[in-house]
Amino acid sequence: QTSVSPSKVILPRGGSVLVTCSTSCDQPKLLGIETPLPKKELLLPGNNRKVYELSNVQEDSQPMCYSNCPDGQSTAKTFLTVYWTPERVELAPLPSWQPVGKNLTLRCQVEGGAPRANLTVVLLRGEKELKREPAVGEPAEVTTTVLVRRDHHGANFSCRTELDLRPQGLELFENTSAPYQLQTFVLPATPPQLVSPRVLEVDTQGTVVCSLDGLFPVSEAQVHLALGDQRLNPTVTYGNDSFSAKASVSVTAEDEGTQRLTCAVILGNQSQETLQTVTIYSFPAPNVILTKPEVSEGTEVTVKCEAHPRAKVTLNGVPAQPLGPRAQLLLKATPEDNGRSFSCSATLEVAGQLIHKNQTRELRVLYGPRLDERDCPGNWTWPENSQQTPMCQAWGNPLPELKCLKDGTFPLPIGESVTVTRDLEGTYLCRARSTQGEVTRKVTVNVLSPRYE
């Protein structure tokens, strides 16, 4: 009778095992082992027992001990079970961002591993088991569907294999896939709200605001603001589930025309976009042209107003005839025209909006000097010792220099408060002088003596 020890062995792939073949008869003609495995005989004294080292065991095998005794030949098999953990445990790749409310299919693939009867595949969210199934097929595949929720954001999904050899006196061997970190998001169907000027003048700055509510996670939202090819650099303010992106936009003459303003919100693998047109225009203030800004009284003056070719102008409230970008008026300069403002107002229609621009020029009329009765009376009679202020106003542009002298030397203190004395009496020659010429006027001061009763 042939016996084998151990009759059953579980060993790691590539491992070695000692197998003892024994026979019950004392003098067997033959005692040995039949196996395709590499073997070594580990010699022992005696004839009825042989020990073999079987090495590099790569797969399940059934070496057979045999003996030939006087009472016949017999055999005994040992069952070698090879164990090895899977060579590949992998979750099928998925986009890391998943919209809330979507069904997500997790697929785990397992290559290799034995014995398959002891191999289980577990799909997990964190440490929570979602599905547990025996490994079947090559590669083994286990799938489960997860309804994506907001609170799944940042959750790690993984796949684990469990080769449970505890019933065989060994341990539980675990292999875990690389985790898949789920990023959940909510991007509302409503496009972002874009507030910006509809028209924008060249060489000015405008403010653009893009906002959207109902986002999750709002901090992960990317905002792209652009005017044509010009990328804007917004300052983004976040709320609980909203953001507001504010940017300054500067435009130059190169941007003139209709430009597309874009606000795109990207979250996860989705985006929402709002487009708006902004008309960029160039509209310089109208030009007011005076023949000469400074003329002498009586000179003929032409006032012209010129504006943008598509503008309509009014000059001093009078619309151009015919209505258009140019207007003019003619006048003979009078002293009353000195300091007169000529105002040109131009109106341009840009994208349905009326834009107004004004320009004002002042005319200087040179005249005088003038000394007249109203402003410089020819006669003053004042009581002696009274307080009086001699007044004499010379008119003209430029303002004349005024001197009133008695006998060519004694000045009358114009505009100053004086105590009237006998010395003040007399006739003064008032001379008003400017670049425009000079005029004179006689002024007499009479001093009344007090009556003594």
Epitope: L18, K40, E41, L42, L43, L44, P45, V51, E53
Partner: antibody, heavy 116, light 107 residues
Framework: EVQLVESGGGLVQPGGSLRLSCAAS????????IHWVRQAPGKGLEWVAR????????IYADSVKGRFTISGDDSKNTAYLQMNSLRAEDTAVYYC?????????WGQGTLVTVSS | DIQMTQSPSSLSASVGDRVTITCRAS??????LHWYQQKPGKAPKLLIY???QSISGVPSRFSGSGSGTDFTLTISSLQPEDFATYYC?????????FGQGTKVEIK
């Protein structure tokens, strides 16, 4: 009947070399493992080296690594221990023994004396 | 390296006595332990392999036990031919190592 016979021992000066032979009979050396074990005078046993004659895989004790070489010749069914750079502490009876994990059969031993 | 420590180093006993020799490994060696008997001027002789497995031709009074780190060789009834030095040896990992020996002498 399994038999192992060592030869080649003797007196050698420190730094010298010696080659020990182990002639096997009653079994084929490539079907098992051959080891050398030594015993210094009045001391215990010390494992020295092992060879798998089927593929010439060898393993050595740290004390002899780089100085001793174990080899086998299938055709002569003989194993060898080439000993170089011998030291006084290598003085011992050298046994050739067989089996894998235990030593079931031993030769009679050969004495190696390293002395000036 | 795994250190093997035998105790006692020597013992005196009478014929018929039950003798126990212990061997302790510095780390677990499962059952990869073997016992040898050596008489002066002779090569060692295998008595027990794999801690407890008997050898054909070795008297049944020799038995071995133990696993892990602690092992025992027992001679149930000491005979005159049993006076010798006994060694344990581990084959769990390289290098294989022997105990320092236990000398059994006549009392």
């Amino acid at each position: 009947e399994v038999q192992l016979v060592e030869s080649g021992g003797g007196l050698v000066q420190p730094g010298g070399s010696l080659r020990l032979s182990c002639a096997a009979s009653g079994f084929n050396i490539k079907d098992t493992y051959i080891h050398w074990v030594r015993q210094a005078p009045g001391k215990g046993l010390e494992w020295v080296a092992r060879i798998d004659p089927a593929n010439d895989n060898t393993i050595y004790a740290d004390s002899v690594k780089g100085r001793f070489t174990i080899s086998g010749d299938d055709s002569k069914n003989t194993a060898y221990l080439q000993m170089n750079s011998l030291r006084a502490e290598d003085t011992a009876v050298y046994y050739c023994t067989t089996s894998g994990y235990w030593f079931a059969y031993w030769g009679q031993g050969t004495l190696v004396t390293v002395s000036s | 390296d795994i250190q093997m420590t035998q105790s006692p180093s020597s013992l005196s006993a009478s014929v018929g006595d039950r003798v126990t020799i212990t061997c302790r490994a510095s780390q677990s060696i499962s059952n990869n332990l073997h016992w040898y008997q050596q008489k002066p001027g002779k090569a060692p002789k295998l008595l027990i392999y794999h801690a407890s497995q008997s050898i054909s031709g070795v008297p049944s009074r020799f038995s071995g036990s133990g696993s892990g780190t602690d092992f025992t060789l027992t001679i149930s009834s000491l005979q005159p031919e049993d006076f010798a030095t006994y060694y344990c040896q581990q084959s769990n990992s390289w290098p294989y190592t022997f105990g320092q020996g236990t000398k059994v002498e006549i009392k």
